[in-house]
């Protein structure tokens, strides 16, 4: 009774190649570039995602202050290493064997090394700070109502928990979502807030992920509400490691 | 193989009740969320009311406080408690479900569903 099963594409993911050769003829779909099962019922994995992206063809403030070890994705796009089961390899390198750590979010975590480099452990981003500026508006949005319209949008959307959701702070212009997800919180089957970041990140954009939808829509009180610009900031759980010379 | 068979559907006089009941089959887990969903003839399908792993609840606001979503996870059965029923309120009533836990009403997040049982409500 699935838009997939109907016929056969991925509602959640544009990204794929779908055909009916799953059991019994089932419709099974395929990231681009790596070719895994995706389950369509859910969000696909941002590691996935930017792998099928790379393979595409080309074309008393209430705002919280983000800690020292807060990283913002500064890199861009890579082609990135997938385990199995879709997440993020500890360690990626690229074509000319300039290798790093990442975390869950695939974010880089350490300074660049050779093909030398360890990384133990792929650490888990347990805090996302979404910080958002909307364009200029008649008069401020009630805090309240944009509070709702964004928890809605994150369970409705992004198949988010509303438990991880943990706050969404408002100074006009700027909107701060935290996410929050521990990897006690975490179970099977529960979509992951670094993937829910990401196909946010990409609505706002003009992106959109999902296939046959229209794009984001985000009203509040029937008021149209306009990113200008997104900034995400990823907090791990373990702090990362990089050295002096890149803070100065 | 997952299964869901819906049961409870029949005709109403405005301003009945009826009880839907869901049960479910084949799951090797109890972490899945489940929902209510229904389909009048010509027209989408919409999200009713959900309940996710926790037993949090969600519904679509034209139902809220009229009807209650529940679950026994020990019968693996899914219920819809639908009070001062109204003629739009006639459709065809699915039990859906969804590995994981969340609280959504749009049916995308749903991947396996029952053949349905009708509602009637008559003026």
């Known amino acids: 009774h699935t838009a997939a099963q109907d016929n056969c594409t991925c509602p959640t993911n544009k990204m794929t190649v779908c055909s009916p050769d799953g059991p019994g003829g089932r419709c099974q779909c395929r990231a681009l570039g790596s070719g895994v099962a995706v389950d369509c019922s859910t969000l696909t994995s941002k590691c996935l995602l930017l792998k099928a992206r790379m393979s595409a063809p080309k074309n008393a403030r209430t705002l919280v202050r983000p800690n020292e070890h807060a990283l913002v994705d500064n890199d861009g796009l890579y082609d990135p290493d997938c385990d199995p089961e879709g997440r993020f390899k500890a360690r990626q390198c690229n074509q000319t064997s300039v290798c790093w750590c990442v975390n869950s979010v695939g974010v880089r975590r350490t300074d660049k090394g050779d093909l030398s480099l360890r990384c133990d452990e792929l650490v888990r981003t347990h805090h996302i700070l979404i910080d958002l500026r909307h364009r200029p508006t008649a008069g401020a949005f009630n805090h309240s109502d944009l509070d709702a319209e964004l928890r809605r949008l994150f369970r409705e959307r992004y198949r988010l928990h509303p438990k991880f959701v943990a706050a969404v702070h408002y100074e006009q212009p700027t909107i701060q979502i935290e996410l929050r997800q521990n990897t006690s919180q975490k179970a099977a089957g529960d979509v992951d807030i670094g993937d829910a970041a990401y196909y946010f990140e990409r609505d706002v954009k003009g992106e959109s992920l999902f296939q046959g939808r229209g794009g984001l829509d985000l009203r509040v009180r029937g008021e149209p509400l306009q990113v200008e610009r997104t900034l995400i900031y990823y907090l791990d759980e373990i702090p990362p490691k990089f050295s002096m010379k890149r803070l100065t | 193989q997952v299964q869901l068979q819906e049961s409870g559907g029949g005709s109403v006089q405005a301003g009945g009740s009826l009880r839907l009941s869901c049960v479910v089959s084949g799951y090797t887990t109890t972490r899945y969320s489940m929902a209510w969903f229904r389909q009048a003839p010509g027209k989408e399908r919409e999200g009713v009311a959900g309940i996710d792993t926790d037993v949090l609840t969600t519904y679509k606001p034209s139902v809220e406080g009229r009807f209650t979503i529940s679950r026994d996870s020990a019968k693996r059965t899914l219920y819809l408690q639908m009070n001062s029923l109204k003629p739009e309120d006639t459709a065809m009533y699915y039990c859906?479900?969804?590995?994981?836990?969340?609280?959504?009403?749009?049916?995308?997040?749903?991947?396996?569903w029952g053949q349905g049982t009708q509602v009637t409500v008559s003026s």
């Open positions: 859906a479900t969804g590995t994981g836990n969340f609280l959504a009403l749009d049916p995308v997040w749903y991947n396996t």
